[in-house]
Amino acid sequence: FERTRSLQDPCSNCPAGTFCDNNRNQICSPCPPNSFSSAGGQRTCDICRQCKGVFRTRKECSSTSNAECDCTPGFHCLGAGCSMCEQDCKQGQELTKKGCKDCCFGTFNDQKRGICRPWTNCSLDGKSVLVNGTKERDVVCGPSPADLSPGASSVTPPAPAREPGHSPQ
């Protein structure tokens, strides 16, 4: 089948990094500068992505693969293949339309991206707050009171996983 196909379509013999040049009697020609073909049998080469402005080149374009971009310091990637760069904020902040804003009391963000999330509500699991939350960190819930009573066994059996409560204390 492959032999038949190649007899019918000489372009199928053109490897990645080349294109089947109709202007030159379907000869396999190398991709021109700043273009690539990642698969064989291509009739055109794709234009290389250019990482400009807030984008930074993570991997140079080659004849067989596109360039890959990431973001300059102070920004982070969003979208498939880093299609967008979004401004970083500090931990304890979130990005709004008006720029970086501190997390409201009762919420935290431990990353430079994303939104402020409510502190865990320990009492929903029958626990109490062991370490207070901050703008940058969630609270730490202590063990359940049953774990602290005299004669409590040292090793507790695993409990079924539950989502943490997410309303502020």
Epitope: R137, C141, G142
Partner: nanobody, 117 residues
Framework: QVQLVESGGGLVQAGGSLRLSCAAS????????VAWYRQAPGKQRELVAV????????KYADSVKGRFTISRDITKNAVDLQMVSLKPEDTAVYTC??????????WGQGTQVTVSS
Amino acid sequence: QVQLVESGGGLVQAGGSLRLSCAASGSIFSYNAVAWYRQAPGKQRELVAVITSGGETTKYADSVKGRFTISRDITKNAVDLQMVSLKPEDTAVYTCAALRNSGSTSWGQGTQVTVSS
């Protein structure tokens, strides 16, 4: 759940020091915090010290402040408790706990610390 194993307990004279270690079978720092508790016979288990997974916050019981230091050892996947100026009232079984806000707490089996006068 992570398996926790404490070591470093023993018999020591008042004024002496011990270093307890809590080693974990899995990543101990994926938990919200790791704490040391102690329990004397017939008494409730009490918090000694706690350290958050990132190491940015530590908290101590008033009775051990200035004498005990909790720290992370990332290379050993462990949390240590350095105890100095030990007193007879520090005698107890010391147990480490990996604390997770959702779900249950993982406990070690404990290590005995006895301080003689």
